[in-house]
Interface confidence: medium
């Protein structure tokens, strides 16, 4: 289980139509459920039920994406309409390019990710989890513009970390 | 069909309560936030406030001009949303309708065809 | 808070691009919906995310957000697109949902 180094962009655009951007720093692990490759794009934040939906008008991304995932505690979705798997693939299916779950919550998602599939799908999927987790979702949570770039080894130059 | 239905508008005189309802069909009530927006005659669209899933928390906010005033609850054993508006002043006469928000964009792809809330004397 | 700033009305001939615009305070940064109201209806959903079209939004439909302008950009403009145009964000510092004041877009003719 090797570390995924993640920055997140976020993007404060300026009245001239630049943009200044700051980025936070944190760490995940490429999971067995997918590939230890690098990746980025726009953030998404999909929530887990949203996942569970298979029809048209749900695919509502273009292709290239990162998709945030928060998992519930497992008591609060008891039968879940999708294995945590199957929700790295639905996600990849509608055009994610990388999926990371926030399992705080439900570090059992960790060995579910990790048990190996004989057809681990081809693009990376990242757990995180304690101090890395609140980083990100405070982050995702401001609904602004941001991206995630994922990275199987450290950034070369170090990065100016802006802690949101 | 994916569908909301608001009931419970009518007139009410200032410091007046009036309770709306939104009845939802189609989809699984329970995975969604839902929010009120209202237009009063001849204006704009104004937020009035939301609700989230319960797995969300279900929680609760509410714009300034309604905040103390109006409650939002849902029953999602009835899959319905509920907007219990007390205190009612003449510039709450508005349409109000009910709306679905795609999970986490806060964008609204569903809508309810509105109820009718008349305040005055 | 972030308000929302829009044109009260813009005209176009039919066949002819129409372009309304939606300002505020570093909008770019903010993710903009857009929706379209005709008379007596509720609203409709044809812009989110900036770009996005939800299914069954014609193609002519089409949308950019950058500095401190979001624009909604109708190509071909039909005689069915004459509405109300309402562009909306939600502001992350007060949790509120935004709207802009409302566009009527006339199509002449």
């Known amino acids: 289980k090797e570390t995924a180094f993640v920055e997140v962009v976020l993007f404060e655009s300026s009245p001239s139509g630049d943009y200044t951007t700051y980025t936070t720093g944190l760490t995940g692990r490429f999971s067995r459920a997918g590939a230890t490759l690098s990746a980025e794009g726009e953030i998404v934040q999909m929530h887990p039920l949203g996942l569970c939906n298979n029809n048209d008008e749900e695919d509502l991304y273009e292709y290239g994406w990162v998709g945030v995932v928060k998992l519930e505690q497992p008591e609060l979705d008891p039968k879940p309409c999708l294995t945590v798997l199957g929700k790295a693939k639905r996600a990849v299916q509608r055009g994610a390019t990388a999926v990371i779950f926030d399992v705080s919550e439900n570090p059992e998602a960790i060995d579910q990710l990790n048990q190996g599939s004989e057809d681990p799908l081809k693009r990376p999927v990242v757990y995180v989890k304690g101090a890395d987790a609140i980083k990100l979702m405070n982050i995702v949570n401001k609904q602004k513009v941001a991206r995630a770039r994922i990275q199987h080894r450290p950034p070369r130059q170090p990065t100016e970390y802006f802690d949101m | 069909e994916v569908q909301l239905v608001e009931s419970g508008g009518g007139l009410v005189k200032p410091g007046g309560s009036l309770r709306l309802s939104c009845a939802a069909s189609g989809f699984t009530f329970s995975d969604y936030g839902i929010h009120w927006v209202r237009q009063a005659p001849g204006k704009g669209l104004e937020w009035v406030g939301r609700?989230?899933?319960?797995?969300?928390?279900?929680?609760?906010e509410y714009a300034a001009p309604v905040k103390g005033r109006f409650t939002i609850s849902r029953d999602d054993s009835k899959n319905t949303l509920y907007l219990q508006m007390n205190s009612l002043k003449t510039e709450d006469t508005a349409v109000y309708y009910c709306?679905?928000?795609?999970?986490?964009?806060?964008?609204?792809?569903?809508w309810g065809q509105g109820t009718l809330v008349t305040v005055s004397s | 808070d972030i308000e929302l700033t829009q044109p009260p009305s813009v005209s176009v001939s039919p066949g002819q691009t129409a372009s309304i615009t939606c300002s505020g305070d570093?909008?770019?940064?903010?993710?903009v919906h857009w929706y379209q109201q005709k008379p007596g209806q509720a609203p409709v959903l044809v812009i989110y995310?900036?770009?996005q079209r939800p299914s069954g939004i014609p193609e002519r439909f089409s949308g950019s957000n950058s500095g401190n302008t979001a624009t909604l950009t109708i190509s071909g403009t039909q005689a069915e697109d004459d509405a109300d145009y309402y562009c909306a964000t939600y502001d992350s510092s007060s949790w509120w949902n935004v709207f802009g004041g409302g566009t009527k877009l006339t199509v002449l003719g």
């Open positions: 709306a679905r928000a795609i999970y986490y964009l806060e964008a609204f792809d569903v």
């Open positions: 570093s909008l770019g940064s903010y993710y």
């Open positions: 995310r900036n770009k």
């Open positions: 609700i989230k899933s319960k797995t969300d928390g279900g929680i609760t």
